[in-house]
């Protein structure tokens, strides 16, 4: 996601499962810290946003032709799992220790 | 990158190494097809944008709170190498068959 002014970084995003309709099958937790990647991918791309070569190229082309080519985008580059208690197909409460890809571990410019 | 109206997809982006100042060390090719990921990550996220669970969650939160949380972003999810002839540290023209991460192979919503 983009954000005015600040550079690409991980910010808080608390998600309530009721808000997204997932409370129908996720029993617990009621909410969790998903985090969000926010901020711009500005030249020069710093090491901490682990840019790919393509992101570096796109950033340089954007510098030269800002109206033609967009900046690279600040996105999750590494995700972490959370533990959930959910209803299985039979409606039985089941604990899944590692429900993958739910929380941002790292952000970067891509 | 984002794009008004159209959904996340791979579009052409021809990059001239002179435009980004890399012609000082890349001898050939003079330009190449880098591609760019353009378009929006709209609800519901289609399978072809290979959304992560976090991207799906963020999309749902954005639907509920559009001013608070951004949409997922359309970015390269798989990159390909290109062959380059470059000047090594001694200035000797050297062929690198696979200079990784230079061209978009696939785009997705992250």
């Amino acid at each position: 996601s983009t954000g005015a002014g600040s550079h690409c970084q991980k910010t808080s995003l608390r998600v309530n499962f009721e808000d997204i309709g997932w409370n129908s099958w996720i029993i617990a937790p009621k909410e969790y810290e998903a985090y969000e990647c926010k901020g711009g991918c500005f030249f020069p791309l710093a090491d901490d946003v682990t840019p790919t070569k393509h992101a570096i190229v796109q950033t340089l082309v954007h510098l030269k032709f800002p109206t033609k080519v967009g900046k690279a985008c600040c996105v999750p580059t590494k995700l972490s799992p959370i533990s959930i208690l959910y209803k299985d197909d039979m409606g039985v409460p089941t604990l899944k220790y590692h429900y993958e890809g739910m929380s941002v571990a790292e952000c970067g410019c891509r | 990158s984002t794009g008004a109206g159209s959904h996340c997809q791979k579009t052409s982006l021809r990059v001239n190494f002179e435009d980004i100042g890399w012609n000082s060390w890349i001898i050939a090719p003079k330009e190449y097809e880098a591609y760019e990921c353009k378009g929006g990550c709209f609800f519901p996220l289609a399978d072809d944008v290979t959304p992560t669970k976090h991207a799906i969650v963020q999309t749902l939160v954005h639907l509920k709170f559009p001013t608070k949380v951004g949409k997922a972003c359309c970015v390269p999810t798989k990159l390909s190498p290109i062959s380059i002839l470059y000047k090594d540290d001694m200035g000797v023209p050297t062929l690198k068959y696979h200079y990784e991460g230079m061209s978009v192979a696939e785009c997705g919503c992250r």
């Epitope: - | 290109i82 002839l85 690198k96 068959y97 696979h98």
Partner: antibody, heavy 120, light 109 residues
Framework: EVQLVQSGAEVKKPGESLKISCKGS????????IGWVRQMPGKGLEWMGI????????TYSPSFQGQVTISADKSISTAYLQWSSLKASDTAMYYC?????????????WGQGTLVTVSS | QSVLTQPPSVSGAPGQRVTISCSGS????????VSWYQQLPGTAPKLLIY???KRPSGVPDRFSGSKSGTSASLAITGLQAEDEADYYC?????????FGGGTKLTVLG
């Protein structure tokens, strides 16, 4: 339609010189690598070297370095392979091939081959 | 002696699945991509697979490539009489391109 057309078969004597050609058409000749591959009778493929016609940059296999010269004339979209002094062991089929645009290590179009026979 | 090692010959009956192996080292296959070529008798080689597992347009999906560590393999399913040919693997080693010695595929009558 992409085509690589090679010059005809040659019969030469040991010690003679030779230059065979490979003419590209149907694509931008200067921006694709052209490789040369040898195939001795009944044997496998051997990579000889490669050239980027735009600047005539070449890279040779260590086995062929100094034995042959690879060149190109971009004005007529033609690549060349030449010997200054042929040996009987140079008897083989020689193929030119075009490297894929972004991947010079994969040859997507091939010439029909030029058979070179060196015999006294 | 080729840098990449292939079996001299393999065979299979029509409709069967055959695989051709290609063994190298960390400096070639281990660190780089693999291509496969088919050479029908009396003709120039044809690119079948590039970048380990990608097929150029026009190559049937009966042909597939894979790579693991310092080895690669070509699989041909639903073997047909017209698949009888020599098959070569290739990879890169620094600035150089290297071929396997070739494998003759015989389709049993």
């Amino acid at each position: 339609e992409v085509q690589l057309v090679q010059s005809g078969a040659e019969v030469k004597k040991p010690g003679e010189s030779l230059k065979i050609s490979c003419k590209g058409s149907g694509y931008s000749f200067t921006t694709y690598w052209i490789g040369w591959v040898r195939q001795m009778p009944g044997k496998g493929l051997e990579w000889m070297g490669i050239i980027y016609p735009e600047g005539s940059y070449t890279t040779y296999s260590p086995s062929f370095q100094g034995q042959v010269t690879i060149s190109a004339d971009k004005s007529i979209s033609t690549a060349y392979l030449q010997w200054s002094s042929l040996k009987a062991s140079d008897t083989a089929m020689y193929y030119c091939a075009r490297g894929k645009r972004v991947d010079a290590s994969s040859f997507d179009y091939w010439g029909q081959g030029t058979l070179v026979t060196v015999s006294s | 002696q080729s840098v990449l090692t292939q079996p001299p010959s393999v065979s299979g009956a029509p409709g069967q699945r055959v695989t051709i192996s290609c063994s190298g080292s960390s400096s070639n296959i281990g660190d780089n991509y693999v291509s496969w070529y088919q050479q029908l008798p009396g003709t120039a080689p044809k690119l079948l697979i590039y970048r380990n597992n990608k097929r150029p347009s026009g190559v049937p999906d009966r042909f597939s490539g894979s790579k693991s560590g310092t080895s690669a393999s070509l699989a041909i399913t639903g073997l047909q009489a017209e698949d009888e040919a020599d098959y070569y693997c290739s990879s890169t080693d620094k600035e150089h391109l290297v071929f396997g010695g070739g494998t003759k595929l015989t389709v049993l009558g």
